[in-house]
């Protein structure tokens, strides 16, 4: 008699997730020296045990302890570049900027990036059919408690000037739904955190506009101002050459406005 | 370039209400706070007040029931408002600029402008 | 409010000297510190922010250093310019306040 398997809303783990996660283990520790003395192995298991048997739905930030614990790493605590639906532009400017870190330039992040994954309560069988979907199922699945937990961490980490790159195409440039409005956000510590600054940035050619002058903007310069942060706000309006001028700063077209 | 001009009556009567502007150029008032401060002759530096780039304010505590910091963004101008003056008022009043987007400290000064308050 | 206390009051001394200017906050002000340079009839002009952060234009000889409640303000061999009036200001709670001031002038 087949078992009856839940049914989620969402897409199932990624294929090979295991191998997937062990491979990028490998290479990160491989490519990062100060990352050497990590045990790949107990890094899957931990981050295995955080999921398998349990009830996608009763995930737990404590969970995840034993991963974090073994993924514990520094980075420079100045130099961190949070991000909102412009993943892609963040991580092309941290492969330029290389002193500058995403969460996805650490381990754990750059361990979990685009994948998902989940198990099964009372089975040790990775579910790879559905898993749960944040908006529809339940948000504290493996994939959204994982993504909160380092988030969190990360941003606990930061410290003076902290930079954040947010989406200029959207409707909402600051989305307090967003895991930087909800998480990141609320756990800079102003005690350490001196200034956010934003980056906007803009999609279309032609747009001049100060996006800087958005209402969602503004509820994100209030929010920050009102737990002791400094906020600063700044347009690209060009990211095409925003990019080209943090690869070449001598250029002389990068002294212009971007 | 930035710049950052007070203007107003260099004598105000005790119990008056002293009247200053703060005229911008170079950037504008949608975009940054501007602060009021204060120094008597040959003292120091005293914080008046803030009105940030939405058009919120904050004040000193010890000067909050006689302030009021307003503006004018499309004449890029900035006010501030003393009342029932004394004596002790009489400083070298300055607008400046935040740093940064909401800034507490100022990159970009006025010249100053003294007030006398006397009968 | 936050008490800032500016020490000494006056310094009278040559050019080519080191300066060591101190600032102590009644509390902690986690590094929310400006230093300001004053001129006779000038506005103030800033310095260094944020403890350590030189503000473009001012020279390298300036450096500010400190954290919790104790920081120094440090010219590293004065020149005929920099006579002058100093305040540390801190900028971790409103009212915003600055210290009283300490004056560096010619020996």
């Known amino acids: 008699v087949p078992r009856w398997r839940q049914q989620w809303s969402g897409p199932g783990t990624t294929k090979r997730f295991p191998e997937t996660v062990l491979a990028r283990c490998v290479k990160y520790t491989e490519i990062h020296p100060e990352m050497r003395h990590v045990d790949c192995q107990s890094v899957w298991d931990a981050f295995k045990g955080a999921f398998i048997s349990k009830h996608p739905c009763n995930i737990t930030e404590e969970d995840y302890q034993p991963l974090m614990k073994l993924g514990t790493q520094t980075v420079p605590c100045n130099k961190i570049l949070l991000w909102s639906r412009i993943k892609d532009l963040a991580h092309q400017f941290t492969q330029v900027q290389r002193d500058m870190f995403t969460l996805e330039d650490t381990l754990l992040g750059y361990l979990a990036d685009d994948l998902t994954w989940c198990g099964e309560f009372n089975t040790s069988k990775i579910n790879y059919q559905s898993c749960p979907d944040w908006r529809k199922d339940c948000s504290n699945n493996p994939v959204s408690v994982f993504w909160k937990t380092v988030s969190r961490r990360f941003a606990e980490a930061a410290c003076d000037v902290v930079h954040v790159m947010l989406n200029g195409s959207r409707s909402k440039i600051f989305d307090k739904n967003s895991t930087f409005g909800s998480v990141e956000v609320h756990n800079l510590q102003p005690e350490k955190v001196q200034t956010l600054e934003a980056w906007v940035i803009h999609g279309g050619r032609e747009d001049s506009r100060d996006l800087c002058q958005d209402p969602t903007i503004k509820e994100l310069e209030s929010i920050i101002s009102k737990r002791n942060i400094q906020f600063s706000c700044k347009n690209i309006y060009r990211p095409d050459k925003f990019l080209q001028c943090v690869k070449n700063p001598e250029d002389s077209s990068c002294t212009s406005e971007i | 370039q930035v710049q950052l001009q007070e203007s107003g009556p260099g004598l105000v009567k005790p119990s008056e209400t002293l009247s200053l502007t703060c005229t911008v150029s170079?950037?504008?008032?949608?975009?940054?706070?501007i602060h009021w401060i204060r120094q008597p002759p040959g003292k120091g530096l005293e914080w008046i007040g803030v009105?940030?780039?939405?058009?919120?304010?904050d004040y000193n505590p010890s000067l909050k029931s006689r302030v009021t910091i307003s503006k004018d963004n499309s004449k890029s101008q900035v006010s501030l408002k003393l009342s029932s003056v004394t004596a002790a008022d009489t400083a070298v009043y300055y607008c400046?600029?935040?740093?940064?987007?909401?800034?507490?400290?100022?990159?970009?000064w006025g010249q100053g402008t003294l007030v006398t308050v006397s009968s | 409010e936050i008490v800032m206390t500016q020490s000494p009051p006056t310094l009278s001394l040559s050019p080519g000297e080191r300066v060591t200017l101190s600032c102590r906050a009644s509390?902690?002000?986690?590094?929310?510190l400006v230093w300001y340079q004053q001129k006779p009839g000038q506005a103030p002009r800033l310095l260094i922010s944020?403890?350590?952060s030189l503000e473009t234009s001012i020279p390298a000889r300036f450096s500010g250093s400190g954290s919790g409640t104790d920081y120094t303000l440090t010219i590293s061999s004065l020149q005929p310019e920099d006579f002058a009036v100093y305040y540390c200001?801190?900028?971790?709670?409103?009212?915003?306040?600055f210290g009283q001031g300490t004056k560096v002038e010619i020996k």
């Open positions: 009105i940030w780039r939405g058009g919120s304010t």
């Open positions: 170079g950037f504008s008032l949608t975009s940054y706070g």
């Open positions: 200001q801190q900028y971790w709670s409103t009212p915003y306040t």
């Open positions: 944020g403890v350590t």
């Open positions: 509390e902690d002000i986690y590094n929310r």
């Open positions: 400046a600029k935040g740093k940064v987007t909401t800034g507490f400290y100022f990159d970009f």
